[in-house]
């Protein structure tokens, strides 16, 4: 057989965060190279990562065309060298990936607190809207643009001097919370898609940001902006 020197890929795994989507597989090639194909259920197969010796393939460009579609990929194994020397004339071995629907399955990236602003006993906390590689009319869309009201943020906040956490939720990127006068607070946010029922419904928590730190004092009489 012409493909005795090539083995089919295995452990095909989708790794996707904020729609940046990479297919990974094994094994590391010794005497073979790989070519990946991707397709929607109703579409044609499109070749990507042609004759690659890598064991990953960035498929972002394909899946962002329609993030609500369901995609299937497959990885072909070709002998590493021209095929005449291996006598290969049969179809190369390949392995199918699990199905992948970006809108439902991409992981939510770690959010970032863009700024907080205190006025008296109110604090406005703004979450940075992450850009994705999803496009509409040649413009890149933000996470909020893509998910709309399906995406909410949860704010965890607490007094610097205590450990008792409070929470707030918003379906925009801003929170307006009540705080005690003269107290410094710390904040962390988490992105959530409540409609998901899987492990990927929540992001990891953002880095903690606290009032009264070196990057800007919080004053009861003024405004404080904290930027990254």
């Amino acid at each position: 057989s012409g493909t005795t020197n090539t083995v089919a890929a295995y452990n095909l795994t989708w790794k996707s965060t904020n729609f940046k989507t990479i297919l990974e597989w094994e094994p590391k090639p010794i005497n073979q190279v790989y070519t990946v194909q991707i397709s929607t259920k109703s579409g044609d197969w499109k070749s990507k990562c042609f004759y690659t010796a890598d064991t990953e393939c960035d498929l972002t460009d394909e899946i962002v065309k329609d993030v609500k579609q369901t995609y299937l990929a497959r990885v072909f194994s070709y002998p590493a060298g021209h095929v005449e020397s291996t006598g290969s004339t049969e179809e190369p071995p390949y392995e199918n990936s699990p199905e992948f629907t970006p809108y439902l399955e991409t992981n939510l990236g770690q959010p970032t607190i863009q700024s907080f602003e205190q006025v008296g006993t109110k604090v406005n906390v703004t979450v940075q809207d992450e850009w994705t590689l999803v496009r509409r009319n040649d413009t890149f869309l933000s996470l909020r643009d893509v998910f709309g009201k399906d995406l909410i943020y949860t704010l965890y906040y607490w007094k610097s001097s205590s450990s008792g956490k409070k929470t707030a939720k918003t379906n925009t990127n801003e929170f307006l919370i009540d705080v005690d006068k003269g107290e410094n607070y710390c904040f962390s946010v988490q992105a959530v898609i409540p409609s998901r029922r899987t492990a990927n419904r929540k992001s990891t928590d953002s880095p903690v940001e606290c009032m009264g730190h070196e990057k800007g004092e919080s004053r009861e009489t003024g405004h404080h902006h904290h930027h990254h």
Partner: antibody, heavy 119, light 113 residues
Amino acid sequence: QVQLVESGGGVVQPGRSLRLSCAASGFTFRSYGMHWVRQAPGKGLEWVAVITYDGINKYYADSVEGRFTISRDNSKNTLYLQMNSLRAEDTAVYYCARDGVYYGVYDYWGQGTLVTVSS
Amino acid sequence: DIVMTQSPDSLAVSLGERATINCKSSQSVLFSSNNKNYLAWYQQKPGQPPKLLIYWASTRESGVPDRFSGSGSGTDFTLTISSLQAEDVAVYYCQQFHSYPLTFGGGTKVEIK
């Protein structure tokens, strides 16, 4: 001996289509990946498309993606390039070339066929 | 995409003298697992298709005279014609076959001085 003979070139208006053929002989065609490479008049070489020996996988230069389709008929020892929505910048000599010692190393080339896109 | 840049654009050398052509890739074409440079050199004479001279940066294709040699690794490569002959007048192209899309250098025209 190995021979690659292109045909199908000619003068065509912008927006129209053309299909190039490459007849292969002197080797086991079904065992080799095949490529199209083009050369605009007085210019350098530009890779256009590749098809694997089995015909399953195809890959294109960004400049022709969605307009050109590479295919092969192993029973006829023939490689094809279907060129749609042709543009003036597609004017070139089109060569078919065979994978050599490794994928993308061309050990044999055809003599080329000239495609002129002009109104 | 890997961009291949050749220099000089043209070169005039006396018969029997050495001709040296450089090729630089925008990223490494050396594959670490087999320590091979995925680079080839072609010769193209007027009115003819290109002819493969060298692959893996330094391996001569069968039938190519030994006055042609290739060297270099990573991103910098050289094609040397040790003693230029009249029949060597041509345009020379480097090409990377490390990753798709495959890309060629712009070519170097070699003439007799």
